[in-house]
């Protein structure tokens, strides 16, 4: 017992931590003072009626990844205040409704990764009227969803079901829940997907399908009996798909009249871009989809891709597209021209070079585009990049951070409406007239700049942290500046006069510099009460670098002796 006690530490607020130890039972002597108890990653196998009897004020109990195989019937009987219960990844093969009956305050319940075959003989959750987040199922033994499983649940913020090996689904099992904001469904096979889809289409707002092999998925007409779908967002995560099955998936999505957002994360497309519809298939209508997000798409036969033209017509209404980290090196001109409503395009972490970008940003491409993100691609010339984007008449925001530009020419051409430019982490060592005068926000942080002397009459925000500047920029060159973030440079001091010269400045972040704590600097910073309102990272990040005897101390705390301040 005593070694068990030693593994647990509690603070004055009743937060007790005893995770990743060698506990083989719940420590004895727990009282009403305990508010939160984390005993995850131990070797607890058994929970008895008396273990938690006195914990009447317990709000969170985390028992994930132990070896729990038995919980006595009344183990949780005094936990009426419990809001968060995590029993995931244990050895509970039979779930009992008596455990949960007393938990009238429960908002979060995680039962994932326990080896039960079903969710028990009776409705487990019918008394949990405040439940918001529920996670159930496992990868291998959970094979059956029954009609009574979710009875009594009317509204859930999030429902996660690991039905990886599901073999039986009783119709209407999920229909009993009137509203689920986010349903996460793990299914290896697609065999029961349509049956489940029918039941959730009118109650789920965001549907997420995980780990499913859709290579052989075929859509057959649904007998929904109703078409009022609530689904606004559909996410496919770690899903396998082919050219043909993608077309079938699109037919499924066609059933969701109010679908606004489509997301594919970590998916594999085993295809070559042959999306031609067979003659008997009617044309797919993309409906109201406004946002398409693709992240880390893996296409094993990428270089065999040959024709995307059948998809072009589906894209005309889309407003926001993200295709991130998917080895994109070219967006066909024709596709760009079809994206007539596109306002936001994020191609971060891809392989774009200026010369191929020119093909993508051809005449009449992306006519409505306002924001273009090309962060961490293969761009190398600011001059070429700006020139390439001149065709985009409505472009106002450009993020080309994390490309290696190194140098900046004296002049560049940019779209005339540009307001925001992100050049952070681009290895530039100077800024020139290449930066457009129309900018309102400029980010040049994390570069090799030792000087900033550009006149930007409309600039409101300047982000220039992590450079090598030794002084604040000249305020007269930035007459409209509201925000200046200049932390982690080589600034040694700044004065009241310098700060006052920024007439419009509301926010200054200048911490993490090597301040020389002179008497003047100290008296200015310590006496100005209003300074704390402007310096958003004051006082924590303002440390003295010299004199040596105060190095590392916060500027606001340093006091120099009279003799140090009155030397002649």
């Amino acid at each position: 017992e005593s070694s068990n006690q030693a593994s647990l530490s509690c603070d004055r607020n009743g937060i007790c931590k005893g995770s990743s130890g060698s506990l083989n039972s719940i420590p004895s002597g727990l009282t009403e003072a305990v508010k939160s108890l984390d005993l995850s990653n131990n070797r607890i196998t058994y929970i008895s009626n008396s273990d938690l009897q006195r914990c009447v004020n317990l709000q969170a109990l985390v028992l994930t990844s132990n070896g729990i195989n038995t919980i006595e019937e009344d183990s949780f009987s005094s936990l009426g205040s419990l809001e968060h219960l995590d029993l995931s990844y244990n050895y509970l093969s039979n779930l009992s409704s008596s455990w949960f009956k007393p938990l009238s305050s429960l908002t979060f319940l995680n039962l994932l990764g326990n080896p039960y075959k079903t969710l028990g003989e009776t409705s487990l959750f019918s008394h949990l009227t405040k439940l918001q987040i529920l996670r159930v199922g496992n990868m291998d033994t959970f094979t059956k969803i029954q009609r009574k499983d979710f009875a009594g649940l009317t509204f859930l913020e999030e429902l996660e079901i690991d039905a990886s090996d599901l073999q039986s689904y009783e119709p209407k099992s999920l229909k009993s829940i009137q509203n689920v904001s986010h349903l996460i469904l793990h299914m290896k096979q697609h065999i029961l997907l349509l049956e489940i889809f029918v039941d959730v289409t009118s109650s789920v707002e965001c549907l997420e399908l995980r780990d499913t092999d859709l290579d052989t998925f075929h859509f057959s007409e649904l007998s929904t009996g109703e078409t009022n779908s609530l689904i606004k967002k559909f996410t496919f995560r770690n899903v396998k798909i082919t050219d043909e099955s993608l077309f079938q998936v699109m037919k499924l999505l066609n059933q969701i009249s109010g679908l606004l957002e489509l997301e594919f994360d970590d998916c594999t497309l085993n295809g070559v871009g042959n999306f031609r519809a067979s003659d008997n298939d009617r044309v797919i209508d993309p409906g109201k989809v406004e946002t398409l997000t693709i992240r880390r798409l893996h296409i094993p036969r990428f270089y065999l891709f040959y024709d995307l033209s059948t998809l072009y017509s589906l894209t005309e209404r889309v407003k926001r597209i993200t295709v991130e980290n998917s080895k994109v090196f070219l967006v066909p001109c024709l596709l760009s021209q079809h994206l007539k409503s596109l306002e936001y395009l994020d191609l971060s972490e891809n392989l774009m070079v200026e010369e191929y970008l020119k093909n993508s940003a051809c005449e009449d491409a992306w006519p409505s585009l306002q924001t273009l993100i090309l962060r961490q691609n293969h761009l190398a010339s600011l001059e070429k990049t700006g020139e390439t984007l001149l065709t985009l008449k409505n472009l106002t925001n450009i993020d080309i951070s994390k490309n290696s530009f190194h140098s900046m020419p004296e002049t560049c051409q940019w779209p005339e409406k540009m307001k925001y430019l992100n050049l952070s982490s681009t290895r530039i060592h100077s800024v020139t007239g290449c930066i457009p005068k129309t900018l309102e926000i400029l980010d040049v942080s994390n570069n090799n700049l030792n000087l900033f002397s550009l006149n930007l009459p409309q600039l409101k925000e300047l982000y220039i942290s992590r450079n090598k500047l030794m002084t604040l920029p000249d305020a007269s060159l930035l007459p409209m500046l509201l925000v200046l973030k200049i932390s982690r440079n080589a600034i040694t001091t700044f004065s009241k006069e310098q700060l006052d010269s920024f007439h419009t400045l509301k926010t200054l972040e200048a911490g993490g510099n090597n301040f020389i704590c002179s008497c003047e600097f100290l008296s200015f910073t310590q006496e100005q009460q209003a300074l704390a309102k402007v310096l958003i990272d004051w006082p924590a990040n303002y440390l003295c670098d010299s004199p040596s005897h105060v190095r590392g101390q916060q500027v606001q705390d340093v006091r120099l002796s009279v003799s140090e301040c009155h030397r002649t």
Epitope: H298, V328, M352, N359
Partner: antibody, heavy 118, light 111 residues
Framework: QVQLVQSGSELKKPGASVKLSCKAS????????INWVRQAPGQGLEWIGW????????NFNENFKDRATITVDTSASTAYMELSSLRSEDTAVYFC???????????WGQGTTVTVSS | DIVLTQSPASLALSLGERATLSCRAS??????????MQWYQQKPGQPPKLLIF???NVESGVPDRFSGSGSGTDFTLKISRVEEEDVGMYFC?????????FGGGTKVEIK
């Protein structure tokens, strides 16, 4: 500046394996692909395969698929190519090259000479 | 595999003369309006050096006497006025389909 520095010459017996290294500097290693290309004495260039350090994905010329392995150590910004079951026809200079824009090789290592002889 | 055939096999030119090197692919290397064809120069004992990518884009730092053209299956590398330092082998390379392939090369010499 961008540099790819390859390991030194190797003399191997038929049937043996060789592991070549290619250390990158002057650019963000995980943002670009690394290709391996070989050139037999007095011959043309032959593409072996590539790796993308960011996700470790590889692609090989079918002629090398069973014998070549390409790996990376991102913490050391180094790519490796191992070729097994060496035969005399594998005698060549092996180059690593940076893959830019998904399609072209803009920086090359100095090459490593591998000689396979009994 | 896409086979790239380069001609001529060798080319002997006088200084200042114009050089035209040809590369023919066994099938099209077009990819949505961009030809995925590169040209490299290789001098003895050195690695290849990129000259042209995407059929016609001159790599940064390459003298402007080099130019590339062509589409589909037929591509040309031109050197407007050959200089002493242009001596070496010239290879074309396609990246339209895997495996990526190189041409057999054209040797450029000065007469």
């Amino acid at each position: 500046q961008v540099q790819l520095v390859q390991s030194g010459s190797e003399l191997k017996k038929p049937g043996a394996s060789v592991k070549l290294s290619c250390k990158a500097s002057g650019f963000t290693f995980t943002t670009y692909g690394i290709n391996w290309v070989r050139q037999a004495p007095g011959q043309g260039l032959e593409w072996i395969g590539w790796i993308y350090p960011r996700d470790g994905s590889t692609n090989f010329n079918e002629n090398f698929k069973d014998r070549a392995t390409i790996t990376v150590d991102t913490s050391a910004s180094t790519a490796y190519m191992e070729l097994s079951s060496l035969r005399s026809e594998d005698t060549a200079v092996y180059f690593c090259a940076r893959l830019t824009g998904g399609t072209f090789l803009d920086y090359w290592g100095q090459g490593t000479t591998v000689t396979v002889s009994s | 595999d896409i086979v790239l055939t380069q001609s001529p096999a060798s080319l002997a030119l006088s200084l200042g003369e114009r050089a035209t090197l040809s590369c023919r692919a066994s099938e099209s290397v077009e990819y949505y309006g961009t030809s995925l064809m590169q040209w490299y120069q290789q001098k003895p004992g050195q690695p290849p050096k990129l000259l042209i990518f995407g059929a016609s884009n001159v790599e940064s730092g390459v003298p402007d006497r080099f130019s590339g053209s062509g589409s589909g299956t037929d591509f040309t590398l031109k050197i407007s006025r050959v200089e002493e330092e242009d001596v070496g082998m010239y290879f074309c390379q396609q990246s339209r389909k895997l495996p990526w392939t190189f041409g057999g090369g054209t040797k450029v010499e000065i007469k």
